[in-house]
Amino acid sequence: QVQVVTQDEREQLYTPASLKCSLQNAQEALIVTWQKKKAVSPENMVTFSENHGVVIQPAYKDKINITQLGLQNSTITFWNITLEDEGCYMCLFNTFGFGKISGTACLTVYVQPIVSLHYKFSEDHLNITCSATARPAPMVFWKVPRSGIENSTVTLSHPNGTTSVTSILHIKDPKNQVGKEVICQVLHLGTVTDFKQTVNKG
């Protein structure tokens, strides 16, 4: 049967993003419509046809355009994605003979981790804090020269859609740690990044 091929995309916040649909059919469509999937009913964003060209709905005027003007292959581009743009989008190819044939492409917005790593001595112990803020939520691990060191982790969700994960390493005999390297590992979207800290006696 006739189908539409799409690909989901993951793009960084405040960068451009494109979604593409391809009608796997010998014939072009008469009109292509892009809609954003919403809880109640989909919202029309933009249409393209030979008769009327590109028609962008007012709510999307400065946000998107059709950057591949095809009736078989259609691409929409968001100029500067925000968290509100995350979601799934439907492309509808209205074809002669077979009606509306649709595909769905989903856009995920990510924010690269911002990491801070610092330590603090008190009289009998040392706290090393590693905090990572990202979208989706990052994971924080420790690489320390010896085992048996306790840590505690706190997760905080922010209104802007990012999540902070703060892990505190509790070292009971700080003298043994002086001059040694501690590594905080941040895992985000399948990539692990090492952040190194050498403890110096203040």
């Epitope: 049967q1 006739v2 059919n25 010998a26 014939q27 072009e28 469509a29 008469l30 008769n51 074809t95 002669f96 003979g97 077979f98 009606g99």
Partner: antibody
Framework: QLVQSGAEVKKPGASVKVSCKAS????????ILWVRQAPGQRLEWMGH????????NYNLKFKGRVTITRDTSASTAYMELSSLRSEDTAVYYC??????????WGQGTLVTVSS | DIQMTQSPSSLSASVGDRVTITCKAS??????LSWFQQKPGKAPKSLIY???RLVDGVPSRFSGSGSGTDFTLTISSLQPEDMATYYC?????????FGQGTKLEIK
């Protein structure tokens, strides 16, 4: 461009299969459609097929009596109408379209249903 | 199904006349309408598609207009060879449906 099979006389309850042979173009690039015209009546859309995929769409008025198929190796489309009745007596035409642009038609096939 | 109603059912006009045939859809069909010419014993011939686009090779005296529910086929200067029956076809919604036809005769 589109050549249809010859006239047929059928008895009520029988089936008829009309062929439409395409030449001079890439068969899978155009939809093949079937319309019919009973004596003194308007044209009636029966259905169509996209030879590229073999996807077809039928007018539900025919209640499953019509089947449109294609043989890409022979560049031929077929329209079969079953459970024939006298009111199916008509000229059956195949045509081709690129989207909604209809350009070539077969010469028509007269199907007479009579006991 | 969408009903297509043509008017008039038949008309007689003289060579050189401007002739207008109308087609009314029972619901909005956008611009998804074609016009066909059919001569006795012959297959239909496409004249206009998408309401106002002329098919290649069709004389420029034929033109189409309209959108939504009301459509018009105009022959600007009638010629003897235009004697035929004219049909409109909607293809906005399946099943696609034809008008009942307008028989055009030359006076």
């Amino acid at each position: 461009q589109l050549v249809q099979s010859g006239a047929e006389v059928k008895k009520p309850g029988a089936s008829v299969k009309v062929s439409c042979k395409a030449s001079g173009y890439s068969f899978t690039d155009y939809i093949i459609l079937w319309v019919r015209q009973a004596p003194g009546q308007r044209l009636e859309w029966m259905g169509h097929i996209d030879p590229y995929y073999g996807s077809s769409n039928y007018n539900l008025k025919f209640k499953g009596r019509v089947t449109i198929t294609r043989d890409t190796s022979a560049s031929t489309a077929y329209m079969e109408l079953s459970s024939l009745r006298s009111e199916d007596t008509a000229v059956y035409y195949c045509g081709r379209s690129k989207r909604d642009y209809f350009d070539y038609w077969g010469q028509g096939t007269l199907v007479t249903v009579s006991s | 199904d969408i009903q297509m109603t043509q008017s008039p059912s038949s008309l007689s006009a003289s060579v050189g006349d401007r002739v207008t045939i109308t087609c009314k859809a029972s619901q909005d069909i956008n611009s998804y309408l074609s016009w066909f010419q059919q001569k006795p014993g012959k297959a239909p011939k496409s004249l206009i598609y998408r309401a106002n686009r002329l098919v290649d090779g069709v004389p420029s005296r034929f033109s189409g207009s309209g959108s939504g529910t009301d459509f018009t086929l105009t022959i600007s200067s009638l010629q003897p060879e235009d004697m035929a029956t004219y049909y409109c076809l909607q293809y906005d919604e399946f099943p696609y449906t034809f008008g009942q036809g307008t028989k055009l005769e030359i006076k």
